[in-house]
Each structure stands twice: as structure tokens, then as C-alpha cells.
């Protein structure tokens, strides 16, 4: 059974992940540049279901495409280089979902834009955090 300390750690990690995802979303929304149009042509795969930490496997699998899109932006809105930002997110995701899990991600039929993708995972983090508090 999860202890109060492990629950607290999970909550903090989710809050960190949430802030990183929100920072990316804000950076994109603030990005007044023709490159935004190209960024929106990238299609992201959405989880069919995202209600448990193991479903973060679906986010992990989309981190490389996310980095690729952020590289397009070359935006001053991000305090870190895309590679470092995605690396930080990857570390958190691996800790949260556990590196031992062999969960096979199941994707929804329809793909999404980067904005829809980020909003989906932001909602996921908020939902899990609310169950922990």
C-alpha cells in the first residue's frame, strides 16, 4: 500500500510535470510566428484511456515528437532548450509510471494538434493530483 511519503512524492512529481506541460503550452500560445502554423501540422497520438499512472507510457512515447515540434519554435518563451526540457519531463514520467511496467499504450483513433495533446495531459495531471489530495 502506498505510504503518505510516497503519495506526497508522487503528488510533487505530478505537479512538476504539470508545470512543465503548462509552460510548454503557454510558450506555444504566446508564440506569434508563422512557425506556429507548421507546429500545428504535427499530429500527436492521444491515449484511448488515461486514468492511471501507467498510462503515462502514452506520453513517454510522444516525447520525441514533442521535442521535434519544440525545436521548430526556437522560442525565447522556454527557459530551457527543448532537449533539456523533454529530458526533464522524461525523467519524471519514468519515475511516475515505473520503468518496470510493460504496459502497451493504446491510442485513440483520431490524432491531435500539439495544443490538444498538451491540454489532454495537463488534464490528466490535474485529475490524478486531485485524487491524491
Amino acid at each position: 500500500a502506498p505510504t503518505s511519503s510516497s503519495t506526497k512524492k508522487t503528488q510533487l512529481q505530478l505537479e512538476h510535470l504539470l508545470l512543465d506541460l503548462q509552460m510548454i503550452l503557454n510558450g506555444i500560445n504566446n508564440y506569434k510566428n508563422p512557425k506556429l502554423t507548421r507546429m500545428l501540422t504535427f499530429k500527436f497520438y492521444m491515449p484511448k484511456k488515461a486514468t492511471e499512472l501507467k498510462h503515462l507510457q502514452c506520453l513517454e512515447e510522444e516525447l520525441k515528437p514533442l521535442e521535434e515540434v519544440l525545436n521548430l519554435a526556437q522560442s525565447k518563451n522556454f527557459h530551457l532548450r527543448p532537449r533539456d526540457l523533454i529530458s526533464n519531463i522524461n525523467v519524471i514520467v519514468l519515475e511516475l509510471k515505473g520503468s518496470e511496467t510493460t504496459f502497451m499504450c493504446e491510442y485513440a483513433d483520431e490524432t491531435a494538434t500539439i495544443v490538444e495533446f498538451l491540454n489532454r495531459w495537463i488534464t490528466f495531471c490535474q485529475s490524478i493530483i486531485s485524487t491524491l489530495t
Epitope: K48, E62, P65, E68, M104, E106, Y107, D109
Partner: antibody, heavy 117, light 108 residues
Framework: EVQLLESGGGLVQPGGSLRLSCAAS????????MSWVRQAPGKGLEWVSA????????YYADSVKGRFTISRDNSKNTLYLQMNSLRAEDTAVYYC??????????WGQGTLVTVSS | EIVLTQSPGTLSLSPGERATLSCRAS???????LAWYQQKPGQAPRLLIY???SRATGIPDRFSGSGSGTDFTLTISRLEPEDFAVYYC?????????FGQGTKVEIK
């Protein structure tokens, strides 16, 4: 373990029809898009058709559009390819492949379709 | 339609040597949508590399992928006897998905 097993291939005359099946196991079939890819003797790979996990969306290569129909029965974990008005150039090994996001992660062993008079 | 051109058509090498296979796209392809497959005679293709550089499950680390835009490379650092096969690149960035014509790696 993921397994894909094609069947239904054989010899058919030009203008004839054939229905290929692909029995899937080892994964939640309804959650994944599936494709058919073919390979003519001694040639490279050619994507033929795809279908979404729900079966609601289908896609075809121009070379087979209007002649081939892809479908799936998620209750039977089976993918199908109905091939009509077959031509000599349709002669190939037909593979079914599981699509995981941007790539095909598992392939069946293939079934040979020969169109000849 | 995005055309993928692989070179060389055939690569004659000895076990232990390094193999470098090229895949050039007719227009820019997002690297997340570029994959490499290996096919041995009488067998189905097997996924080797996805996202241009990520190794698929169970693929030895002697296989590596790189590249972006229109130029992609598959490298086999030290050829093992079981590596002699045909290799295909594939893109799913444009519609329809397309494959390169293949590079055959044969024993010298």
C-alpha cells in the same frame, strides 16, 4: 505475445475475387489501427490499405482504390481484405501489420496471392 | 506522395565490417515518422528503428539510426552473420505511407 496470422491467399484468374483474413492475438485488437502491405515477387514493400481501431476510418493506395475493401471484426479479432477485379500486377505476398502510432511494430508471415490465367 | 530513395541498392561486406545505409526523401519528413525494417528471405519484415533513431524492443545496439529532414541513415556498427538481409526505410509523415526500394546487405 503478439501474433498475426494471414490466410485466404491462392491462385485466382484476372478479374476474379479473393478475401484475405488476418487473425490477431496477444493484444487489444480494437485499440490499434491495422494495415495491409504487399510485396510482389522479388520486389519491395508497398502499402495497400489501412483501417482505424474502431473501423470507422479506412484508407487505400491509389492502385487498389475502388477494387479492394478493408474491414475488421473486433469481436473476432480479425482483419479482412476483400479484393475484387484482380489484376496480374496484384500478384504478391500480402502482409497484415499492426500499426503503433507512426510505425508498424508487428507483421504477420504473409499469404501469397497469384493472379494468373 | 513522398518518394524514398535508398542507396546503395546492394552493399557487399564481410562480417565484422560497418554498414552504412542511406534513405533520401523527396521532401522533408518529420524524423518521428521515419522507420527502418529488416527482411530476411521468406520472412516478414521486422521493425528495427522508429522515430529515425529509437531502437525497437529486442534490437541489438549495433543498429543505430540518424538523420533529419530529407536524409536518414541506418548504421550497423559490426555486421553479424544474421544481419545479412534487405533493409527498408519507411515514412508515415505524408499520405500514403511509403517505403524505400530496399538495400540488400550481402556477404562479400
Amino acid at each position: 505475445e503478439v501474433q498475426l496470422l494471414e490466410s485466404g491467399g491462392g491462385l485466382v484468374q484476372p478479374g476474379g475475387s479473393l478475401r484475405l483474413s488476418c487473425a490477431a492475438s496477444g493484444f487489444t485488437f480494437s485499440s490499434y489501427a491495422m494495415s495491409w502491405v504487399r510485396q510482389a515477387p522479388g520486389k519491395g514493400l508497398e502499402w495497400v490499405s489501412a483501417i482505424s481501431g474502431s473501423g470507422g476510418s479506412t484508407y487505400y493506395a491509389d492502385s487498389v482504390k475502388g477494387r479492394f475493401t478493408i474491414s475488421r471484426d473486433n469481436s473476432k479479432n480479425t482483419l479482412y481484405l476483400q479484393m475484387n477485379s484482380l489484376r496480374a500486377e496484384d500478384t504478391a505476398v500480402y502482409y497484415c501489420a499492426k500499426r503503433h502510432a507512426r510505425y508498424f511494430d508487428y507483421w504477420g508471415q504473409g499469404t501469397l496471392v497469384t493472379v494468373s490465367s | 506522395e513522398i518518394v524514398l530513395t535508398q542507396s546503395p541498392g546492394t552493399l557487399s561486406l564481410s562480417p565484422g565490417e560497418r554498414a552504412t545505409l542511406s534513405c533520401r526523401a523527396s521532401q522533408s519528413v518529420s524524423s518521428s515518422y521515419l522507420a527502418w525494417y529488416q527482411q530476411k528471405p521468406g520472412q516478414a519484415p521486422r521493425l528495427l528503428i522508429y522515430g529515425a533513431s529509437s531502437r525497437a524492443t529486442g534490437i541489438p545496439d549495433r543498429f543505430s539510426g540518424s538523420g533529419s529532414g530529407t536524409d536518414f541513415t541506418l548504421t550497423i556498427s559490426r555486421l553479424e552473420p544474421e544481419d545479412f538481409a534487405v533493409y527498408y526505410c519507411q515514412q508515415t509523415w505524408g499520405s500514403p505511407p511509403t517505403f524505400g526500394q530496399g538495400t540488400k546487405v550481402e556477404i562479400k
